[in-house]
């Protein structure tokens, strides 16, 4: 979706020798790394599905779009793309599906034009807090990143470190306040159970936020108030049960917002009344007529928009003396 694209103009392919061979000399302007295809006209280099274990050292200085997908990179060290002269034009970098499990501090340093970065479909067990900021200063130099695509970067359960995966990702997003200019953030399919409460407040430029296909149960402690530029919020395929008044008011007040809520297990009891009232009048929810109840059983598959207050009841809590064992 947001990964770098290239035109289909003349790709030259290099001889198939090992890409890990380090060249002491700066690369020739028209040189193409082994196992890659290059198009100077399109400013694009593609090293796709070649089982590379390292980032090629001899990338041409003209590269603007770099595809390193479907490889076996494992680790992205500090300065993985630092070159002399620097890759000053590199704007879009796609590393998806390259078996990365570790991204170290400063991995993307010396890429002054990097606007799009896609790390999707890598089992990132170890994402340094300083992966994107490059330094451990409390305020780093602003990152040029505008789009950060981190879909399906959750490692398998047995490979996770003894810490919160959500916390690890958020630490990298917030370090040094480097990503203040970020406009698109995709975090789909990461088994997120919660969203740390401070993350959105520190990404004020966000236009597009994709949190779909996670396990978010509640947004009670998440504030959208400061995201005045937010245009799309994808919350499909989570575990949301209800949205409460505070969240509804914040979403309703955002001037550009479109919200996507499909395929959540909505609980249609008395706590749902405010949300149903809101849904009936709001225009910000896309496809709101598709939202259906999952619980309680008697309400399953009922359309939220068709419910009225009489449908939304809560079973009374019996006093202890009336409860049966």
């Amino acid at each position: 979706s947001s990964s770098p694209t290239s035109s289909a103009s003349s790709f030259s392919s290099s001889a198939p020798f090992l890409a890990s061979a380090v060249s002491a000399q700066p690369p020739l302007p028209d040189q193409c790394p082994a196992l890659c295809e290059c198009s100077e006209a399109a400013r694009t280099v593609k090293c796709v599905n070649r089982n590379l274990t390292e980032v090629p050292t001899d990338l041409p200085a003209y590269v603007r779009n770099l595809f390193l997908t479907g490889n076996q990179l494992a680790v992205l060290p500090a300065g993985a793309f630092a070159r002399r002269p620097p890759l000053a034009e590199l704007a879009a970098l796609n590393l998806s599906g390259s078996r990365l499990d570790e991204v170290r501090a400063g991995a993307f340093e010396h890429l002054p034009s990097l606007r799009q970065l896609d790390l999707s479909h890598n089992p990132l067990a170890d994402l340094s807090p300083f992966a994107f900021s490059g330094s451990n200063a409390s305020v780093s130099a602003p990152s040029p990143l505008v789009e950060l695509i981190l879909n399906h970067i959750v490692p398998p359960e047995d490979e996770r470190q003894n810490r919160s995966f959500e916390g690890m990702v958020v630490a990298a997003l917030l370090a040094g306040r480097a990503l203040q200019g970020l406009r698109r953030l995709e975090l789909a399919s990461n088994h997120f159970l919660y969203l740390p409460r401070d993350v959105l407040a520190q990404l004020p430029s966000l236009r597009h936020l994709d949190l779909s296909n996670n396990s978010l149960v509640s947004l009670t402690y998440v504030s959208f108030r400061n995201l005045t530029h937010l245009e799309s919020l994808h919350l499909e395929d989570n575990a949301l049960k209800v949205l409460h008044n505070g969240t509804l008011a914040e979403l309703q007040g955002l001037p550009h917002i479109r919200v996507f809520l499909d395929n959540n297990p909505w609980v249609c009891d008395c706590h749902m009344a405010d949300m149903v009232t809101w849904l009936k009048e709001t225009e910000v929810v896309q496809g709101k007529d598709r939202l259906t109840c999952a619980y309680p059983e008697k309400m399953r598959n009922r359309v939220l928009l068709e419910l009225n207050s009489a449908d939304l009841d809560c079973d009374p809590i019996l006093p202890p003396s009336l409860q049966t064992s």
């Epitope: 309703q252 001037p255 550009h256 709001t282 496809g287 007529d289």
Partner: antibody
Amino acid sequence: EVKLVESGGGLVQPGGSLSLSCAASGFTFTDYYMSWVRQPPGKALEWLGFIRNKGNGYTTENSASVKGRFTISRDNSQSILYLQMNALRAEDSATYYCARYRGNPHYAMDYWGQGTSVTVSS
Amino acid sequence: DIVLTQFPASLAVSLGQRATISCRASESVEFYGTSFLQWYQQKPGQPPKLLIYGASNVESGVPARFSGSGSGTDFSLSIHPVEEDDIAMYFCQQSRKVPSTFGGGTKLEIK
């Protein structure tokens, strides 16, 4: 740059029909609600209706004053908004504007076309 | 339908002074904490131009001389200091309920 250009206005007899078009550019047309508003000479603005975006099924809402006579539609492949006007009356004479709703449609219209003039007279 | 009553119908203000235009709604235009009331400026032969949305948010590119206030049913547009370029018609609009409705307009002139 967002641009809206209306066309199709002109002189029509009472009881006649007219179709107005609005060519949109500079934004993702299918993401936005679109609207028609009219203004008789020297008078206030009157909202005629809107058509929703792709996410909300391109359904329409119309003002009671034109319901049954005016129809709003859109050609999303060409980014064109239409207003089909039937059974026209003298009081329908006005400048007709097409307008784009903000991303959150509750905040109403942020961009307007220059308008096209419709005169209903025998 | 929600009726918007705008007053005064016309207003003459000296350059550099403050102009205040009011708009009253027949029922609340608030929805989940936001008042969905806009202000537009219209010059002769031109389409309306959005100045203020959500009662008090100044549209991008609009001079800071323009401000909006109010909530529920009572709203005002303030221009200070008034400049020659501000000579125009001003309309309020509610988008809380369908049909959206406009006020009758206020004509701003220079004294």
